[in-house]
Every structure is written in structure tokens, then in C-alpha cells.
């Protein structure tokens, strides 16, 4: 086939490193799935580069990605979610590099939201709750969540708790009194689907009371 890059463009291109990574998000917009890919090297000149996915699609054999600045993106219902797809970087119709990927193994969940902390005076504990859109989904329903919290003054001293529910109890005796805490949560697929951690939820800030404090929600 003709129509490839001319004047040594391809030869030059082949010297570059076109390593890329992708993640999928299932039912991210109603019944639509998304697939996002980007080059590992942020300095790659993406001007004439295209991404294409072929195989393990419904109704079509190949689909081309849309380019949004430095990322490449598809939103579609047409992922078969069985078997591997071939994802290729192309220039002028010629493939530079390809990866065979099962989209069910590169799932990145949506970030949890509505994180809050309520102090229970009688129980001397803090009830952490959050929400996830995945409770309503057909495919990626089972997640492992990572709740991370730290005392605000301890920049890098994060404590982590893994849980499969959306509710966690922190005992008051395990936290410093009269201290400001930051807490956040992220999710990863935990059954059949595999992949990556979601983005972190927005952080929630709460203050631990003195030993005797009135009940109610912690002020953010």
C-alpha cells in the first residue's frame, strides 16, 4: 500500500521510542466504555502519530482514536471485552509499534467521591464513608478500596487501610487528639477485572476532638 510517510520520515520515526500505556474505563458514560492511551515519553513528537485498535470489537474490526492534546481516546459501546485487541501507533497508515492487550486487564475505576468522616462520641470512633459509581455498574462492580489518612503535619506518613466495603471505622485511640487529619480513598478492580488504581478522591479534612467533644460531623 502506498501513502506512507515520505523522505525518510519513517526511518527517523523508527529511531524514536514509541512505548505507550493504556487504561480502559467500563460503563464510564452510561453503556459507553472508554480507552485512553498515551506515550511513556512525554517528549515524543505526536504531530502525525495516530492510535488504532483492531480486534475484540463488536461490529467493526478496527477503530481509530481521537487525539486530545497528548492523549489518545476512544469512547464506544463496541468493546467485546473477550480476548485481546491489537493497539497500534501509526504514522501515515504504517504501524510503528503495537501491543496485544485484553481490555479487561487494564481497567482503571472511576475515583470514589462523597468522602466524609463523622465522629461518634459514645463509641469514641470515626465513621468514614464514601461512594463509588461502580455500585451501579454491570461489569466492574467488585473493587478493593485503599483509604489513606495522615496527620496534616506528617507530610509523608500515610496510613493505609484496604477494604471492600464503602464504610470504615477508625478508633479514636489510634489517632492523635486535637489534630487535623487528611483522608482520601482510591479503588482498584478486585474480581475478574484487573488493572490500575483509580485517581484519588478529593481529600477530606477533619479534626480530632479533645477527649470530651460533642458528637456530629467533623468540620471540613
Amino acid at each position: 500500500e502506498s501513502g506512507y510517510a515520505q523522505n525518510g520520515d519513517l526511518e527517523d520515526a523508527e529511531l524514536d521510542d514509541y512505548s505507550f500505556s493504556c487504561y480502559s474505563q467500563l460503563e464510564v458514560n452510561g453503556s459507553q466504555h472508554s480507552l485512553t492511551c498515551a506515550f511513556e515519553d512525554p517528549d515524543v513528537n505526536t504531530t502525525n502519530l495516530e492510535f488504532e485498535i483492531c480486534g475484540a470489537l463488536v461490529e467493526v474490526k478496527c477503530l481509530s482514536f481521537r487525539k486530545l492534546q497528548e492523549i489518545y481516546f476512544i469512547e464506544t459501546k463496541k468493546f467485546l471485552l473477550i480476548g485481546k485487541s491489537n493497539i497500534c501507533v501509526k504514522v501515515g497508515g504504517k504501524s510503528l509499534t503495537c501491543k496485544k492487550i485484553d481490555l479487561t486487564t487494564i481497567v482503571k475505576p472511576e475515583a470514589p467521591f462523597d468522602l466524609s468522616v463523622i465522629y461518634r462520641e459514645g463509641a469514641n470512633d470515626f465513621v468514614v464513608t464514601f461512594n463509588t459509581s461502580h455500585l451501579q455498574k454491570k461489569y466492574v462492580k467488585v473493587l478493593m478500596h485503599d483509604v489513606a489518612y495522615r496527620q496534616e503535619k506528617d507530610e509523608n506518613k500515610w496510613m493505609h487501610v484496604n477494604l471492600s466495603s464503602t464504610k470504615l471505622t477508625l478508633l479514636q485511640r489510634n489517632l492523635q487528639p486535637e489534630a487535623m487529619y487528611e483522608i482520601k480513598v482510591r479503588s482498584i478492580p478486585d474480581h475478574y477485572f484487573k488493572g490500575f488504581w483509580s485517581e484519588w478522591s478529593p481529600s477530606y479534612y477533619f479534626r480530632t476532638p479533645e477527649i470530651n467533644n460533642s458528637p456530629g460531623e467533623m468540620d471540613p
Epitope: 500500500e1 501513502g3 495516530e50 488504532e52 483492531c54 463488536v58 461490529e59 467493526v60 474490526k61 478496527c62 477503530l63 481509530s64 476512544i74 464506544t76 459501546k77 463496541k78 497500534c88 501509526k90 501515515g92 497508515g93 504501524s95
Partner: antibody, heavy 114, light 106 residues
Framework: QLKESGPGLVQPSQTLSLTCTVS????????IAWIRQSPGKGLEWMGV???????DYNSAIRSRLSISRDSSKSQVFLRMNSLQSEDTAMYFC??????????WGQGVVVTVSS | EIVLTQSPTTMAASPGEKVTITCRAS?????MHWFQQKSGSSPKPWIY???DLASGVPDRFSGSGSGTSYSLTISSMEAEDAATYYC?????????FGGGTKLELK
């Protein structure tokens, strides 16, 4: 965005050559199908050339059909041999999009007659 | 190949009347697609992925169905809706079209 061209009249047993010229779309990133429409057979999907260069054909006419492309000229070609009167039809090229056959050419009338 | 049978083959509807065109597949398909064609023109995408309206299609049109049974509905017939409607399946090769339903204004 798609325009078919080719001879309007073809002799029986001869070969039909049609061209679909694509504008406003990057040919290497698109899938182009050929469809024909005749009073007797209605709309008939003939075949497709995918963005990766693979082709798929309607098994009923596969042995007579070839679809290729020249990306530098933004053109897709249909060649079909051993034409008979039942191949008389309006021939369309269309994009096999993510959702449907979303862009169609205006069509070209092909008559098979001596 | 999957055979698509459209019914009715022809019909006439008065302005304001509700119209339903059906398309039955000989085997289950993932989605059904519908096209509108007027005399002398190429088919226009009308409904895709069984129920999504193509750009510019009035919302009096709707599509529904699953498996082997699909339909296109016009909630209130208008003069400009007079045309031939075709269904298409892309779930298996060869892609196949229904025989068409010619809708006329009464």
C-alpha cells in the same frame, strides 16, 4: 466526503473498476465499505477495507471481488470480474464508522449490457 | 448469513399517526441500525446502535429492540417522513440489510 466514479456501462463477462475518493477524512484511519443497490436484490453489502488494510468480503461474491486502496491519493478501489446483467446496480462507498455506516457517497450507476 | 425481514413492505400513514416498522433477524444480533432513503438519494443513517438517533433526526423517531426483534417508531407521522426505511445488522458477515419498508403519506 465520499465520491464514487467509474464507467456507467460494462460489457457482460468484463471487469468492473470503481474508485471511491475520500475527502475530509484520513483514509488510513477509516474503514471503507462498498454497498450496491439493485431493484431485484435491494441493498447488498459487498465488502470492506479496514483501517489496518485487512479486507472482508461478502461470501456470495468473494471469488469475483477485490477491494484495495491508495492512501496517498485518498482512494479506495473496487474490482469485480465476470459481470453479468444481475450486477446492474447503483454502487455506493460508505464509511464503516464506530456506530454505523455513517457517511455515504452519492452512488454511481453501473449497467451491465452488450 | 443473517436474514433481516422487514414488515410491512409498504404502508401509508396520515399526518399525526403513530407508525411502527419492525425488523426480525434470523439470528440474534448485537445492534440494529436504520437508514432512511428518499428517491434519487443515498441512504442516510437514521438510528444507530438500536436506539440512538443520528444527528439531525427529529425526536419523534425512536428505535428499540434486542436479540432478533427490533423496531423503528414514529410517534406522529409528518409529510417529510415519507421515505423507504432499511434495517442493517453488522454483527456478522456478510452485513445484511432488510428488504425495506416504503412509508407513504396518506
Amino acid at each position: 466526503q465520499l465520491k464514487e466514479s467509474g464507467p456507467g456501462l460494462v460489457q457482460p463477462s468484463q471487469t468492473l473498476s470503481l474508485t471511491c475518493t475520500v475527502s475530509g477524512l484520513s483514509l488510513p484511519n477509516n474503514n471503507i465499505a462498498w454497498i450496491r443497490q439493485s431493484p431485484g436484490k435491494g441493498l447488498e453489502w459487498m465488502g470492506v477495507i479496514w483501517s489496518n488494510g485487512d479486507t472482508d468480503y461478502n461470501s456470495a461474491i468473494r471469488s469475483r471481488l477485490s477491494i484495495s486502496r491508495d492512501s496517498s491519493k485518498s482512494q479506495v478501489f473496487l474490482r469485480m470480474n465476470s459481470l453479468q446483467s444481475e450486477d446492474t446496480a447503483m454502487y455506493f462507498c460508505a464509511r464503516e464508522g464506530m456506530t454505523t455506516l455513517d457517511y455515504w457517497g452519492q452512488g454511481v450507476v453501473v449497467t451491465v449490457s452488450s | 448469513e443473517i436474514v433481516l425481514t422487514q414488515s410491512p413492505t409498504t404502508m401509508a400513514a396520515s399526518p399525526g399517526e403513530k407508525v411502527t416498522i419492525t425488523c426480525r433477524a434470523s439470528s440474534s444480533v448485537s445492534y440494529m441500525h436504520w437508514f432512511q432513503q428518499k428517491s434519487g438519494s443515498s441512504p442516510k443513517p437514521w438510528i444507530y446502535d438500536s436506539s440512538d438517533l443520528a444527528s439531525g433526526v427529529p425526536d419523534r423517531f425512536s428505535g428499540s429492540g434486542s436479540g432478533t426483534s427490533y423496531s423503528l417508531t414514529i410517534s406522529s407521522m409528518e409529510a417529510e417522513d415519507a421515505a423507504t426505511y432499511y434495517c442493517l445488522q453488522r454483527s456478522s458477515y456478510p452485513r445484511t440489510f432488510g428488504g425495506g419498508t416504503k412509508l407513504e403519506l396518506k
